[in-house]
């Protein structure tokens, strides 16, 4: 089978500062030199793009300057970090990997990582 398998954790809990990190790993059927990684959010069967980056194997992953995502790559593994998350952003985050070059093109879609975000409690006023 020449399909591409993508693995990602089932559940991740965001930090109190609204930061969530997870690893997206893909089993490449070929030797890709150019890879595109996209994070999608699925809610009520609607899918929206959170962020995307294309990188050359061996080089760093570069998201757009205004992106809420950052990441690093190592071989067939991508370490993704999503920042600025709030409780309303809780949901399923899908890792999509595309082997862009050389031919043939391959698509790989993970099962998704459920990210739970809990807004921090506001600090009580101190009486000092």
């Amino acid at each position: 089978c020449k399909a591409m398998h993508v693995a990602q954790p089932a559940v991740v809990l965001a930090s109190s500062r609204g930061i969530a990190s997870f690893v997206c790993e893909y089993a490449s059927p070929g030797k890709a030199t150019e890879v595109r990684v996209t994070v999608l959010r699925q809610a009520d069967s609607q899918v929206t793009e959170v962020c995307a980056a294309t990188y050359m194997m061996g080089n760093e992953l570069t998201f757009l300057d205004d992106s809420i995502c950052t990441g690093t790559s190592s071989g067939n593994q991508v370490n993704l970090t999503i920042q600025g998350l709030r409780a309303m952003d809780t949901g399923l985050y899908i890792c999509k990997v595309e082997l862009m070059y050389p031919p043939p093109y391959y698509l790989g879609i993970g099962n998704g990582t459920q990210i739970y975000v809990i807004d921090p409690e506001p600090c009580p006023d101190s009486d000092f």
């Epitope: 399909a3 996209t38 862009m100 698509l107």
Partner: antibody
Framework: QVQLVESGGGVVQPGRSLRLSCAAS????????MHWVRQAPGTGLEWVAV????????YYADPVKGRFTISRDNSKNTLYLQMNSLRDDDTAVYYC???????????WGQGTMVTVSS | EIVLTQSPGTLSLSPGERATLSCRAS???????LAWYQQKPGQAPRLLIY???SRATGIPDRFSGSGSGTDFTLTISRLEPEDFAVYYC?????????FGPGTKVDIK
Amino acid sequence: QVQLVESGGGVVQPGRSLRLSCAASGFTFSSYGMHWVRQAPGTGLEWVAVIWYEGRNKYYADPVKGRFTISRDNSKNTLYLQMNSLRDDDTAVYYCARAGDLGAFDIWGQGTMVTVSS
Amino acid sequence: EIVLTQSPGTLSLSPGERATLSCRASQSVSSSYLAWYQQKPGQAPRLLIYGASSRATGIPDRFSGSGSGTDFTLTISRLEPEDFAVYYCQQYGSSPFTFGPGTKVDIK
């Protein structure tokens, strides 16, 4: 709303050229791969070509390789198919289609007819 | 290249009946990358099912998809008059992207 509208079809002689256009609206064009799919009269669907995102990566079906060129202008939200050295068996309705977030072709244009005949 | 074969070529049924359409791949296809489309005469194809079993937006629940590996099925539980059309399966996991030859569902 999300829409694709093809244009540029017509009747052309074998060996000649034609350029098809596909105008996109209602979505962030540069965030999606775009395909051309054709359908000869009375037959099934045949994938023709795809162009990804910024337009750097393109792939073609064997029957059109070396004759057809897919391109896109993200500033104009438009997809193109330049068809050279046209043959009788290129006669078909040509559809543009969007590769959705999860890969399937989720939005299709209405199609434009190309007839290659002497 | 992954070759897709569909059967039967034509399915003659009456409204209200159940339709079962088959799609077979020449090599294993991940279920994540198998789609079904509906096409009516003079119209563009319409995405029905993606990922082998997920219904596209706005598709009625009488349409369902199943299968894995090399064998996939589209089921229409109770045919409505508007369901008589041609149905195509497609793999989109790798290039070249390929379609099956189609199954025509017509009125008996």
